[in-house]
């Protein structure tokens, strides 16, 4: 085994670069000491360092740690938090081009329709933003109260247009018909399947991102242990103490120093795979009914054939309802 | 169906050009992000070795520090000694992850089934009780826009996908982006307190 | 560490096939990409396309779709590219390349395969 | 496609100075740009990524800087070893090489 060089007489070199570190020289020897206080960097004979050093040391190797990481996850980082406003941002556009190709089919199709089918559409794509971002709204209730809301106003200004403006009673009793006469078919549950399951998909996709940048942001900010930040001084600084400035690590006894400190880390590796093929595999089946973008872009068109499907039956509808608002009609005629 | 107003669609023939050439629709940026999040998936499991070789290791030199003294790079010294004597390595691994890193695999345990539970095949068929109305089925031929769910659910015709995100701003600034500390970046021979 | 060695020279007749091979060591092959780039004689470098080892999931770069076949084997931690009836243009040096593990740019780079095609 | 626009294709400098080559992204590439150093006979050598982040073992005379779809890569102190051809890598989709730049020292 080579014999160690003898240790810097003086302790210049260690102060020199020492003062890098923390300058103001006076935690320095002047010259090797017995170095009986430390606690680290063992030493076998005379060294330049001292408590104060060592405390120093262990701050600063812990600090490398935490700088490392950050370098480590900084692409990583950026392509996740990237992503992520990204769709949020896409998600948004979608839900605002739906509201208008939906405004824009009453305005053609429904002029009469369009004040009160505004504000209605406007809610429900309201809730859906809402939905996406993580709200706790029940799909079924947000397409429930879209065809509760326009019914009436489907009832008065299209199949009963005789029929005054506000009449609140007979909106009730329309709003209750409307279910029980299945009024617009099997469109109200067809929208639901289609909406619920496309926003579930999307919302979990976006949960997940989000989900992505608190992990790396949790391992970006970890605070290693004392042990560790030991471990570290030992392996990095403390060949320092005898003067051996020029000196590196050994490579095979780094990755034993490393596979301590990170042994929680790594535990996150099984999970951060699994997350992302997880992730993989949702993505895949986002299409068809499972794409939000699909499904909300073409609402407009099954709200348009929800309502030709009204108006197909309309005369059917008018009696039956008749009767059975008749309650409601008379109080208001009165 | 309903009526396309103008100002919100080009000719549908031209659009379909568009969109199986070059649109770049939400569906194609999903598949990217995966194709580079799987760039990523050793990230953790690397991680020691990343830190290894971007701190001081002796890579050509004769001789290393292996935590107590000065060895031969190749002898079997160099990566044990610096443990002996000392607080127990194992120990340390023993302790387990900290609570912070329990917490974030909870988490990823948790994302993971729902995301599980999302993809599973059972849950993509599309329910056959939307026919039971015996609603007009339309025509859904080759020419036509992608029919949602087949025939009998009021042959909803989506119209080709938005180009949408041509109004995304790409550049978003990672400084604007939430959970983003601003860190100087630390270049591994510029870290201020590792002696070159 | 990180090494990538490719099969050696080839020399082929024009409208005939060729197979180049990549064996991968020093990390897990099947949680990289591997890319293959394709550099003519005196001018620079063209990325063919990549593939993903774990799932056999690829990208080409359109240019190189039905000339480049991208395949691997998992067994012996090797990535293959294909390229069909070859003309004087494909003569080149292509390389493999693995995309990186904490950045997706290609980190680790074979020594490169003469490929001339001649009759 | 991504279309990557390098200059210099080539230039001459003196041992000790510096040098700067510059690569235009045809879009915004989000910082994903990579920078190569070619020798011949060799595979290239992956000098920088993420427009500024030095590869490990890589010495800091080699520095990267930008944003947007303007990037640039200089090499300070030049000394022998340098010659070679340099290249910058996108990518942000899929990837696109520039032309490279070759450089001599005078």
């Known amino acids: 085994q080579p014999p160690p060089p003898p240790p810097d007489a003086t302790c210049h070199q260690v102060r020199s670069f020492f003062q890098r570190l923390q300058p103001g020289l006076k935690w320095v020897p002047e010259t090797p000491v017995p170095g009986s206080d430390l606690q680290v960097c063992l030493p076998k004979g005379p060294t330049c360092c001292s408590r104060k050093m060592e405390e120093k040391y262990q701050l600063t190797a812990r600090l490398n740690m935490e700088q490392l990481l950050q370098s480590a996850s900084m692409e990583l980082k950026f392509l996740i938090i990237q992503n992520a406003a990204v769709f949020q941002e896409a998600f948004e556009i979608v839900v605002r081009h739906a509201k208008n190709y939906t405004n824009a089919m009453f305005k053609n199709n429904y002029p009469s329709l369009t004040p009160q089918a505004f504000e209605f559409v406007g809610e429900f794509f309201t809730d859906v933003s809402l939905y996406i971002l993580g709200s706790d709204i029940n799909v079924d209730d947000m397409v429930n109260e879209l065809f509760d809301s326009l019914f009436p106003v489907i009832y008065t200004q299209l199949m009963n247009p005789g029929l005054p403006d506000s009449a609140l009673d007979i909106n009730e009793c329309l709003r209750g018909a409307r279910r029980d006469l299945k009024v617009f078919g099997n469109f109200p549950k067809l929208i639901m399947t289609q909406v619920s399951k496309s926003l579930q998909v999307t919302r979990i996709f976006l949960q997940a991102l989000n989900l992505g940048i608190e992990v790396i942001n949790t391992t970006d900010h970890l605070k290693f242990s004392k042990d560790c930040g030991r471990m570290l001084t030992r392996m990095w600084y403390c060949s320092y103490c005898q003067g051996l400035m020029m000196v590196k690590p050994c490579g095979g006894y780094c990755n034993v120093v490393m596979q301590g400190c990170m042994a929680g880390v790594v535990e996150i590796d099984k999970y951060w795979r699994e997350y992302i093929l997880s992730l993989e595999e949702l993505v895949n089946g986002m299409y068809r009914i499972y794409d939000m973008e699909n499904v909300l872009l073409g609402l407009f068109s099954t709200i348009h054939d929800s309502i030709q499907y009204v108006q197909k039956n309309a005369g059917k509808l008018t009696t039956t309802i008749g009767k059975l608002c008749a309650h409601s009609q008379q109080r208001q005629y009165r | 169906s309903a009526y396309y107003p103008e100002d919100l669609f080009i000719d549908k023939k031209v659009l379909k050009v568009a969109h199986v050439e070059h649109e770049e629709t939400l569906s194609s940026r999903r598949r990217e992000l995966i194709q580079k999040l799987k760039s990523f998936i050793s990230f953790y499991s690397a991680l020691p070795g990343y830190i290894c070789s971007h701190s001081p290791v002796a890579e050509n030199d004769t001789l290393c520090w292996n935590g107590q003294e000065l060895v031969e790079r190749y002898s079997q010294k160099a990566a044990r000694n610096g443990m002996k004597n000392q607080f127990n390595l194992h120990e340390l691994k023993m302790k387990g992850p900290e609570p912070v890193v329990s917490q974030i695999i909870d988490k990823l345990k948790h994302i993971n089934q729902l995301l599980r539970t999302m993809s599973m095949p059972k849950g993509r068929v599309l329910d056959k009780n939307l026919d039971e109305e015996g609603f007009e089925s339309g025509d859904c031929g080759d020419d036509e826009d992608e029919c949602i769910g087949g025939s009998g659910d009021g042959m909803i015709k989506v119209k080709n996908q938005l180009r949408f995100l041509a109004e995304l701003a790409y550049d978003l600034d990672v400084d604007d982006a939430p959970g983003n500390s601003q860190q100087a970046t630390p270049k591994d021979n510029e870290i201020s307190t590792f002696h070159n | 560490q990180v090494q990538l060695q490719q099969s050696g020279p080839e020399l082929v007749k024009p409208g005939a096939s060729v197979k180049i091979s990549c064996k991968a060591s020093?990390?897990?092959?099947?949680?990289?990409?591997m890319n293959w780039v394709k550099q003519r004689p005196g001018k620079g470098l063209e990325w063919i396309g990549r593939i993903y080892p774990g799932d056999g999931d690829t990208n080409y770069n359109g240019r190189f779709k039905g000339k480049a076949t991208l395949t691997v084997d998992k067994s012996s931690s090797t990535a293959y590219m294909q390229l069909s009836s070859l003309t004087s243009e494909d003569s080149a040096v292509y390389f493999c390349?693995?995309?990186?593990?904490?950045?997706?740019?290609?980190?680790?780079w074979g020594q490169g395969t003469t490929l001339t095609v001649s009759s | 496609d991504i279309q990557m626009t390098q200059s210099p294709s080539s230039l001459s400098a003196s041992l000790g100075g510096k040098v700067t080559i510059t690569c235009k992204a045809s879009q915004d590439i989000n910082k994903y740009i990579a920078w190569y150093q070619h020798k011949p006979g060799k595979g290239p050598r992956l000098l920088i990524h993420?427009?500024?982040t030095l590869q490990p073992g890589i010495p800091s005379r080699f520095s990267g800087s930008g944003s947007g779809r303007d990037y640039s890569f200089s090499i300070s102190n030049l000394e022998p070893e340098d010659i070679a051809t340099y290249y910058c890598?996108?990518?942000?989709?899929?990837?696109?090489f520039g032309g490279g730049t070759k450089l001599e020292i005078k």
């Open positions: 390349a693995r995309g990186g593990v904490f950045t997706m740019a290609l980190d680790h």
């Open positions: 020093g990390y897990a092959f099947s949680s990289s990409w």
């Open positions: 993420y427009t500024s």
């Open positions: 890598l996108q990518y942000d989709n899929l990837f696109t």
